[in-house]
């Protein structure tokens, strides 16, 4: 288990961090599932997209999201081990012109249609909390992560090292 102090070293600077350039350094398609292998799916309902966390039927095709990786600049003294690397932020887009957004007031995760440059609410700091799993921390609200609550995506506050590896903020990325 990893202590939260390592996370806080970096996330203290998130409010001030700026994206390096306007283009992602890397993009690829992947399906998103929970730690317990439920799929994250997206459905168009009443001209807006809804996000669901559900078990797929056998051979049912998984929805893909476009993961775009952006380098973030932040003070070098925030680096925990002197590495030269830049913190990575991601945006997630399941369909053209729509991106996952953090709604910090409602503690919800929503799909919004928007144009580039994307707002800060669409950027998430990427973490490797657990082997083969990633977590998404809100750029706009350090310590708050995308998580699963009542079969929906929600924003979950992580306030202790015990909660850092909690299953409901762990996600798997799969290219198949």
């Amino acid at each position: 288990a990893f202590g939260i102090s390592g996370v806080q070293k970096y996330t203290r600077a998130l409010h001030d961090s700026s994206i390096t350039g306007i283009s992602p350094i890397t993009e690829y398609l992947a399906s998103l599932s929970t730690y317990n292998d439920q799929s994250i799916t997206f459905a168009l309902e009443d001209e807006s997209y809804e996000i669901y966390v559900e078990d797929l039927k056998k051979d049912e095709k998984k929805d893909k999201v476009l993961l775009s990786y952006y380098e973030s600049q932040h003070p070098s003294n925030e680096s925990g081990d002197g590495v030269d690397g830049k913190m990575l932020m991601v945006t997630l887009s399941p369909t053209k012109d729509f991106w996952l957004h953090a709604n910090n007031k409602e503690h919800s995760v929503e799909l919004h249609k928007c144009e580039k440059p994307l707002p800060d609410q669409a950027f998430f700091v990427l973490h490797n909390m657990h082997s083969n799993c990633v977590s998404f921390e809100c750029k706009t609200d350090p310590g708050v992560f995308i998580g699963v609550k009542d079969n929906h995506l929600a924003l979950i506050k992580v306030d202790s090292s015990e909660n850092l590896c909690t299953e409901n903020i762990l996600f798997k990325l799969s290219e198949t």
Epitope: V7, Y28, A30, G80, L126, H127, V134
Partner: nanobody, 121 residues
Framework: QVQLVESGGGLVQPGGSLRLSCAAS????????MGWHRQAPGKQRELVAV???????NYADSVKGRFTISRDNSKNTVYLQMNSLRAEDTAVYYC???????????????WGQGTLVTVSS
């Protein structure tokens, strides 16, 4: 500290082949993806190809069908097989990796120093 060391660049004739390698070392906990970018003189750096830990790949349109990216997860090494090389492939090729270290869960972007590929007759 995470280091990326590239090798395999050089001078090759049009239509020829080269294989680039990039090895990552240091306090690596997890590697999310490894990839190659290139920068030609007077141009911006551009993505060539990327391979994820799960084996998914993405290629720039200009190299599809000619370049193949592969990865040895156990060695944290990525390869770029470049066939049917053209003059416009001349550039410095940079290795890029997204990885977390033992001191932090945050995924960071690391770059190699680059290796020069020159395609000329």
């Amino acid at each position: 500290q995470v280091q990326l060391v590239e090798s395999g660049g050089g001078l090759v004739q049009p239509g020829g082949s080269l294989r680039l390698s990039c090895a990552a070392s240091g306090s690596i906990r997890t590697v999310n993806y490894m990839g190659w970018h290139r920068q030609a003189p007077g141009k911006q750096r551009e993505l060539v190809a990327v391979v994820t830990s799960g084996g998914g790949t993405n290629y720039a349109d200009s190299v599809k069908g000619r370049f193949t990216i592969s990865r040895d997860n156990s060695k944290n090494t990525v390869y770029l097989q470049m066939n049917s090389l053209r003059a416009e492939d001349t550039a410095v090729y940079y290795c890029n990796a997204a990885a977390s270290t033992y001191s932090s869960t945050v995924v960071r972007s690391f770059w190699g120093q680059g290796t020069l590929v020159t395609v000329s007759s």
